[in-house]
């Protein structure tokens, strides 16, 4: 039980960290290439991981202006790191009925980041709802 609890906590920490990185990037939205990117919204149940991978695959880019380029590039790179997998995530990977990334509405970086954050928050909420024990201790 303890190792599975630790795994769940690692997953939760990773999702929370991604939100912090998204919030950091939102401060630099004017230094991002104003390109429209697929931004899933109102993601149907069991397609969260598919939508998550769409956000990770999107070509968010620094406009290479000013002295924020390094922090932006590092933040983008960190957003693309694979999170610890969960049973739910493994199950969802087998779903073939989720929309393709291209089918999602494309949005500029500001809205793209807001929608990414909303999805991460939804995934944290689902993760918490599926947990039976009431502690976040590691």
């Amino acid at each position: 039980h303890k190792s599975s609890s630790q795994g769940q906590d690692r997953h939760m920490i990773r999702m929370r960290q991604l939100i912090d990185i998204v919030d950091q990037l939102k401060n630099y939205v004017n230094d991002l290439v104003p390109e429209f990117l697929p931004a899933p919204e109102d993601v149907e149940t069991n397609c969260e991981w598919s939508a998550f991978s769409c956000f990770q695959k999107a070509q968010l880019k620094s406009a290479n202006t000013g002295n924020n380029e390094r922090i932006i590039n590092v933040s983008i790179k960190k957003l693309k790191r694979k999170p610890p997998s969960t049973n739910a995530g493994r199950r969802q990977k087998h779903r073939l009925t989720c929309p393709s990334c291209d089918s999602y509405e494309k949005k500029p970086p500001k809205e793209f980041l807001e929608r990414f954050k909303s999805l991460l928050q939804k995934m944290i909420h689902q993760h918490l709802s599926s947990r039976t024990h009431g502690s976040e201790d590691s």
Epitope: D9, M12, R16, Q17, K78, E136, S138
Partner: antibody, heavy 117, light 106 residues
Amino acid sequence: QVQLVQSGAEVKKPGASVKVSCKASGYTFTDYWMHWVRQAPGQGLEWMGLIDTSDSYTIYNQKFKGRVTMTRDTSTSTVYMELSSLRSEDTAVYYCARYGPLAMDYWGQGTLVTVSS
Amino acid sequence: DIQMTQSPSSLSASVGDRVTITCRASQDISNYLNWYQQKPGKAPKLLIYYTSRLHSGVPSRFSGSGSGTDFTLTISSLQPEDFATYYCQQFHTLRTFGGGTKVEIK
């Protein structure tokens, strides 16, 4: 058990810098990010920023940007918070706190920094 | 920035009393709210995370509720060790703490 042990009290002159350390034990250091929070005498808590202990990535409270630098040394499982251009308003107790799944789950004992001419 | 406002800033109560502390966010923070307890000269301790979930080892007399912008910390029957200052903290967007509520002995 998880422990965060901070460096001792410091007295600094206005305009100087201070570097506070926080040594972690009882868990895998690079698995958890670390926050820094401060508390002026008789006042509330103020979040300063956080550091990813695995790669030194930082996110700072805009209020402290340009004055605060957070670093880490994985060989000693220690994080550092340096605050420059000190002024009297920076007199406070500075805490490190571990980035738990959804909260700051373990805290250091605090380090009092007094800024006085 | 999200501002967090706690009320009251202080209150006097007796052992056995039911105590309620409120916290209001300047914008919707969903359930992204934590509560900490701090005693004089000590570091804060986590009590409740994600609005209503009790941190391990925290007595069940502590409970949290709310959503959106309005949140409550309740101590169902105040014990001598509960006299302390309580802080709410949002983690919807980075981190911000409330100003604190000091619970004193009546």
